[in-house]
């Protein structure tokens, strides 16, 4: 029962995590204009992996896609790649883990196959989570570097008469969504790996051997003795759970963005 619960919970946690990684990747608020210690402007800037947006106080929002590929910073390209790899691995992991779920019966799939699939999906989730965390962290590091660079020359003067205010950017909501989502996917993956250990079918250490004592025709099966003495770690009798009628519909909603271009 504990194995099924661990596997099911791992799947659900990973599902939420991957949905979060997808949401974070699509979000426009990876970096937002720093409002602290800045002149109050009637314009608010924020940027994502795919486009940058400007929201005027009047309510008008304009978003422009990064239509160049070669002109973008290498770091941004790297972050994009990490997030996409994370999503792809996570999606494959989800697909694999659905078939690996103990509560789902597919033909005459053996427990050993389900255990392998659970381990595979678990590893995929772990790598997916790490990719997301790495991607978000690289972007955050890029922001911190740029923030302090722009703080150093906050105002660039023209002969001391006219001042140009540099827009500083700080952490956007997508970074926090990405970190949490990556963490959840990682945790879900670990849970799947733990569940895999419990799913692996027990292997009997001793083959059943017939001993013929003189004058008697009795067969002794040492396996029985072994079980009673508590030898070995995988010797407990395992119950087979039929999964019951417990079906959960996972409805995942994504944040909708309304951009008035």
């Amino acid at each position: 029962m504990a194995v099924t619960a661990c596997q099911g919970l791992g799947f659900v946690v990973s599902l939420i995590g991957i949905a979060g990684i997808i949401a974070a990747t699509c979000m426009d608020q990876w970096s937002t204009q720093d409002l602290y210690n800045n002149p109050v402007t009637a314009v608010f800037n924020y940027q994502g992996l795919w486009r940058s947006c400007v929201r005027e106080s009047s309510g008008f929002t304009e978003c422009r896609g990064y239509f160049t590929l070669l002109g973008l910073p290498a770091m941004l390209q790297a972050v994009r790649a990490l997030m996409i790899v994370g999503i792809v691995l996570g999606a494959i992991g989800l697909l694999v883990s659905i078939f690996a779920l103990k509560c789902i019966r597919i033909g005459s799939m053996e427990d050993s196959a389900k255990a392998n699939m659970t381990l595979t999906s678990g590893i995929m989730f772990i790598v997916s989570g790490l990719c997301a965390i790495a991607g978000v962290s690289v972007f955050a590091n890029m922001l911190v570097t740029n923030f302090w660079m722009s703080t150093a020359n906050m105002y660039t003067g023209m002969g001391g008469m006219v001042q140009t205010v540099q827009t500083r950017y700080t952490f956007g909501a997508a970074l926090f969504v990405g970190w949490v989502a990556g963490g959840l996917t990682l945790i879900g993956g670990v849970m799947m790996c733990i569940a895999c250990r419990g799913l692996a079918p027990e292997e009997t250490n001793y083959k059943a051997v017939s001993y013929h004592a003189s004058g008697h025709s009795v067969a002794y099966k040492p396996g029985g003795f072994k079980a009673s003495t508590g030898f070995g770690s995988n010797t407990k009798n395992k119950k087979i759970y039929d999964g019951g009628a417990r079906t959960e519909d996972e409805v995942q909603s994504y944040p909708s963005k309304h951009d008035y271009v």
Epitope: N45, Q47, E56, T164
Partner: antibody, heavy 117, light 113 residues
Framework: QVQLKESGPGLVAPSQTLSITCTVS????????VQWVRQPPGKGLEWLGV???????NYNSALLSRLSISKDTSKSQVFLKMNSLKTDDTAMYYC???????????WGQGTLVTVSA | DIVMTQSPSSLTVTAGEKVTMNCKSS????????????LAWYRQKPGQPPKLLIY???TRGSGVPDRFTGSGSGTDFALTISSVQAEDLAVYYC?????????FGAGTKLDLK
């Protein structure tokens, strides 16, 4: 079509409070902000403040302590209140809709407020 | 506060002539996020409320004739009327739409000979 109409008291005594209402039609206050601008006789335009669609307000720093802008979205009305009036507050007061680029794309005809004893 | 300086304070021109007036801000009105300049131009005819001519420094407002052209970036802006008409007799104001408070310039008065 878009219309804005200011209604004010006309004459106000010094040290009293000025209340002007801007009634709008042709657009919703949930989607657009309203800015207030005044113009003393024979002088230039002076920006007073704004209330944006979300309800957030910004004021002219020189009038910050005396000015307050609010709105009643359901009645399509925006209110300007200015206390401790002085004679140099005598001006034509305009309300205008906040449009693209935070500019004032539609203006009311204005209401003349005279501060005099 | 941002100071908007308009020049000249008054202009006298003949109908059909091309005219240019200037506006200078004490800080750059260029937003790096969308590369737009947050400056507007208004025309105020005697006894009337102001009318929006240009926003984003160079975009004409609705119903504004194409003889009006806004230009400039950062701190220096200009409004050009390619062929002045009698109805253009007015005071022209520029406005900072980027920094609060959204200050106006003192205006340029356009007179006809």
């Amino acid at each position: 079509q878009v219309q804005l109409k200011e209604s004010g008291p006309g004459l106000v005594a010094p040290s009293q409070t000025l209340s002007i209402t801007c009634t709008v039609s042709g657009f919703s206050l949930t989607n657009y902000g309203v800015q207030w601008v005044r113009q003393p006789p024979g002088k230039g335009l002076e920006w007073l403040g704004v209330i944006w669609a979300g309800g957030n307000t910004n004021y002219n720093s020189a009038l910050l302590s005396r000015l307050s802008i609010s709105k009643d979205t359901s009645k399509s009305q925006v209110f300007l209140k200015m206390n401790s009036l002085k004679t140099d507050d005598t001006a034509m007061y305009y309300c205008a809709r906040g449009g693209y680029g935070n500019s004032c794309d539609y203006w009311g005809q204005g209401t003349l407020v005279t501060v005099s004893a | 506060d941002i100071v908007m300086t308009q020049s000249p304070s008054s202009l006298t021109v003949t109908a059909g002539e091309k005219v240019t007036m200037n506006c200078k801000s004490s800080q750059s009105l260029l937003n790096s996020g969308n590369q737009k300049n947050y400056l507007a131009w208004y025309r105020q005819k005697p006894g009337q409320p102001p009318k929006l001519l240009i926003y984003w420094a160079s975009t004409r407002g609705s119903g504004v004739p194409d003889r009006f052209t806004g230009s400039g970036s950062g701190t220096d802006f200009a409004l050009t009327i390619s062929s002045v008409q009698a109805e253009d007799l007015a005071v022209y104001y520029c406005q900072n739409d980027y920094f609060y408070p959204l200050t106006f310039g003192a205006g340029t008065k356009l007179d006809l000979k």
